[in-house]
């Protein structure tokens, strides 16, 4: 039994880091493998993560962490029984993938303006809370070419757009994702999408 693709990990910078790897053949990850992780610190003790299958030869493990700070560094040991398959390390602050925003809502009753709001996925005491920026994706269900991205570079989790920038009388969907420049994070996953019917009054033409 060998590791074909070494573990790579990302942290949500709150409580979970996710590590993925591939074995050289079909593996029952949860019964055959264990990922041990330990904070590099005087008083830390090793924790065991039981991996799950992620495709035939792929494994994924969710490492629980009670806290994350920029100084943290973890050692990782991948075991198959008594055999050490791989040894590595992981610094959560250098591999951050933010949590996805939630509660995306489209408010359509604001005088021909669409107001999209969503929730910051972090509590106020988390460092990322005040450092997230967002991308909002809006697309038409009827026209695949009608697909647009709005970059929200301010901190407020909301976006206002004129309803007239979209076609009237058809249905649209929106979703949002987040990233944080301060830790050069990857983008989060997209939030669940929300759907609305876009309709607005066409302005009368003046002659």
């Amino acid at each position: 039994m060998k590791v074909l693709q070494e573990p790579t990990c990302v942290s949500d910078y709150m409580s979970i880091s996710t590590c993925e790897w591939k074995m050289n053949g079909p593996t029952n990850c949860s019964t055959e493998l264990r990922l041990l992780y330990q904070l590099v610190f005087l008083l830390s003790e090793a924790h065991t993560c039981i991996p799950e299958n992620n495709g035939g030869a792929g494994c994924v493990c969710h490492l629980l962490m009670d806290d994350v700070v920029s100084a943290d560094n973890y050692t990782l040991d991948l075991w198959a029984g008594q055999q050490l398959l791989w040894k590595g390390s992981f610094k959560p602050s250098e591999h951050v993938k933010p949590r996805a925003p939630g509660n995306l809502t489209v408010h359509t009753n604001v005088s021909d303006t669409l107001l999209l709001t969503w929730s910051n996925p972090y509590p106020p005491d988390n460092y990322l809370y005040n450092h997230l920026t967002y991308a909002v994706n809006i697309w038409s269900e009827n026209d695949p070419a009608d697909f647009r991205i709005y970059n929200v570079t301010y901190l407020e989790p909301s976006l206002r757009i004129a309803a007239s920038t979209l076609k009237s009388g058809i249905s649209y969907r929106a979703r949002v994702r987040a990233w944080a420049q301060c830790y050069n994070t990857t983008w989060s996953e997209w939030s669940p999408s929300t759907k609305w019917h876009n309709s607005y009054r066409e302005p009368f033409e003046q002659h």
């Epitope: 610190f41 005087l42 008083l43 003790e45 009670d66 806290d67 700070v69 920029s70 100084a71």
Partner: antibody, heavy 117, light 107 residues
Framework: EVQLLESGGGLVQPGGSLRLSCAAS????????MSWVRQAPGKGLEWVSV????????YYADSVKGRFTISRDNSKNTLYLQMNSLRAEDTAVYYC??????????WGQGTLVTVSS | DIQMTQSPSSVSASVGDRVTITCRAS??????FAWYQQKPGKAPKLLIY???SLLSGVPSRFSGSGSGTDFTLTISSLQPEDFATYYC?????????FGPGTKVDFK
């Protein structure tokens, strides 16, 4: 809500012994290292001892090494400090404290130990 | 043992002042470093851990910085409840050690 409640302090003669206890609640006790920190009257803070979450590792300040023993009972959510061969300079308020990356994020109210003849 | 020195030992300040307290370690201690506030007759309260991480519930006017041997606690705008004694502490190696304290009192 995290709570730490020390007990067992009091007046003891030089050379005597005391056992301090710290009852913990509001968190997963066995997941965290715990420390004892003391403060002599009118003085600063002095770290005394620490024990890992499992109880497998213990460390002591040089001033108490060989005289004090830290222990824990994770089934009872309780931390202990057995103090032997007490000296006048051990007189202090003793605090138990929960570890957070080597710092102490929750403290008990303290228990006073007075060593005097 | 790692020795911690704090300066100043006391500072007189007014509400609204910016107050800076420094702590120097006798050898490099990475980022395992903390700041505490203590008021008379009370247990210390953790403000900053891992050198710069603000503990949940601590006002944002408190901030910590530094690494290696030199660390700083800054109170951006002193409030009436901030008059107290402040201690630094290293957790890079045993024995853990505290600084002697800095008393912040009314000018």
């Amino acid at each position: 809500e995290v709570q730490l409640l020390e007990s067992g302090g009091g007046l003891v003669q030089p050379g005597g012994s005391l056992r301090l206890s710290c009852a913990a609640s509001g968190f997963t006790f066995s997941s965290y290292a715990m420390s004892w920190v003391r403060q002599a009257p009118g003085k600063g803070l002095e770290w005394v001892s620490v024990i890992s979450g499992s109880g497998g590792s213990t460390y002591y300040a040089d001033s108490v090494k060989g005289r004090f023993t830290i222990s824990r009972d994770n089934s009872k959510n309780t931390l202990y400090l057995q103090m032997n061969s007490l000296r006048a300079e051990d007189t202090a308020v003793y605090y138990c404290a929960k570890d957070r990356r080597g710092s102490f994020d929750y403290w008990g109210q303290g228990t006073l130990v007075t060593v005097s003849s | 043992d790692i020795q911690m020195t704090q300066s100043p030992s006391s500072v007189s300040a007014s509400v609204g002042d910016r107050v800076t307290i420094t702590c120097r370690a006798s050898q490099g201690i990475s980022s395992w470093f903390a700041w505490y506030q203590q008021k008379p007759g009370k247990a210390p309260k953790l403000l900053i851990y891992a050198a710069s991480s603000l503990l949940s519930g601590v006002p944002s006017r408190f901030s910590g910085s530094g690494s290696g041997t030199d660390f700083t606690l800054t109170i951006s705008s002193l409030q009436p409840e901030d008059f107290a004694t402040y201690y630094c502490q290293q957790a890079n190696s045993f024995p853990f050690t505290f600084g002697p304290g800095t008393k912040v009192d009314f000018k």
